[in-house]
Interface confidence: medium
Amino acid sequence: VPRWRQQWSGPGTTKRFPETVLARCVKYTEIHPEMRHVDCQSVWDAFKGAFISKHPCNITEEDYQPLMKLGTQTVPCNKILLWSRIKDLAHQFTQVQRDMFTLEDTLLGYLADDLTWCGEFNTSKINYQSCPDWRKDCSNNPVSVFWKTVSRRFAEAACDVVHVMLNGSRSKIFDKNSTFGSVEVHNLQPEKVQTLEAWVIHGGREDSRDLCQDPTIKELESIISKRNIQFSCKNIYRPDKFLQCVKNPEDSSCTSEI
């Protein structure tokens, strides 16, 4: 008789989740010599141990500590790029500007990017049918707690100038409820970080508005200034040209406003 299973509102664990995590770990450690010492089987065991046999609405940051320890990684603290609601462009940027890093360019971020996972209380099974939705079910679910934990640690490590890419096409360019707005902003360390520099990415080709004057950007500046951190904002009017100029900074068209 099939056992009754909790139905959650969100999609279930990504198919072939264990294999995907393990394969990503192996690939990452091969590409990044500084992480070659990492034992990917131990990483998977620690990852699994964070959520297997636990109620998927009762996950804590402590559950992920063994994984955090194994995935400890030093990135240049003054080369951190945060992003909110504009992941693809942020990743395209760091693929070109190889000395800058998003969270997903680190081992732990790379392992979990775009994946979903959860288990069930008191069984060693992975739930491939459904997982808790952050809004409809609970916030302390395995995926949300993971990203909150790694995002906090990533922000805490930042120093000097921290960049954040924001989506100028959204109604809330800065959203207090995003991971950036609820976790990363509040975990930048004022004694290490001098300036948060926001890059507001424009969507429309003919959009010449100064989105740095947007009320939500002013709200971000207010939060940042109260944390003793300077704030700077730049409009990126042409994201396609912006990327092109990162690739070819000597191009004559790259001296003008982008």
Partner: antibody, heavy 117, light 110 residues
């Protein structure tokens, strides 16, 4: 070090461009470079800053419109002043805030602007 | 812009004495405040940053403190070389506050 230049005797309603030149470091690194002025026998007055990383330019509310701060090269930042009046007569300093809240601890010696007919 | 009200405008004290200068911010600027010393014909010299941190090379006779929106610079064991004008500055340059200076305090050493 920082050195200001461009100070001069100008007539009222005239314009002037002051230049701040860095030596020993460059503005390719992200710094806050600020202009501050001091009228003879008076106190210090903050005018504007430029963040050399993004080009962000906060101004004192009284300075908006007549003053324009720009990064013109990897070693120069300028301050353009228009519609000059006698009240703009002052020594103009440029200064660098170099690190995490360590205050503006690198100053030029200043350049004198005199506005008189 | 934030308004920085500095008091007194002038203060006189004997060598070996103590001087206290206050700076009141019109709004909460956290610890985003610096103190400078300026002598005639010279640019300002940084003494204190982040309200209470001593700048490198500055004597420990200079002490900065904060209570809410009121900031204090205390100079103890006064020396003749301390005769100068002292300024406070809000060191947040963004549009929230602006890098406003206080009006200055002249310190005369007798």
């Amino acid at each position: 070090s920082l050195e200001e230049s461009g100070g001069d005797l100008v007539k009222p309603a005239g314009s002037l461009t002051l230049t701040c030149t860095a030596s020993g470091f460059s503005f390719s690194t992200s710094y806050w470079i600020c202009w501050v002025r001091q009228a003879p026998g008076k106190g210090l007055e903050w005018i504007a800053c430029i963040y050399t990383g993004s080009g962000s330019t906060p101004y004192a509310s009284w300075a908006k419109g007549r003053f324009t701060i720009s990064k013109t090269s990897s070693t120069t930042v300028t301050l353009q002043v228009t519609s000059l009046t006698a009240a703009d007569t002052a020594t103009y300093f440029c200064a660098r805030d170099p690190g995490v809240h360590s205050g503006t601890n690198l100053w030029g010696q200043g350049t004198l602007v005199s506005v008189s007919s | 812009d934030v308004v920085m009200t500095q008091t007194p405008a002038s203060v006189s004290a004997a060598v070996g004495g103590t001087v206290t200068i206050k700076c009141q911010a019109s709004e909460d600027i956290n610890t985003l405040l610096a103190w400078y010393q300026q002598k005639p014909g010279q640019p300002p010299k940084l003494l204190i940053y982040l309200a209470s941190n001593l700048a490198s090379g500055v004597s420990s006779r200079f002490k900065g403190s904060r209570s809410g929106t009121e900031f204090t610079l205390t100079i103890s064991d006064l020396e003749c070389a301390d005769a100068a004008t002292y300024y406070c500055q809000c060191t947040y340059y963004g549009s929230t506050y602006g890098g406003t200076f206080g009006g200055g305090t002249e310190v005369v050493v007798k």
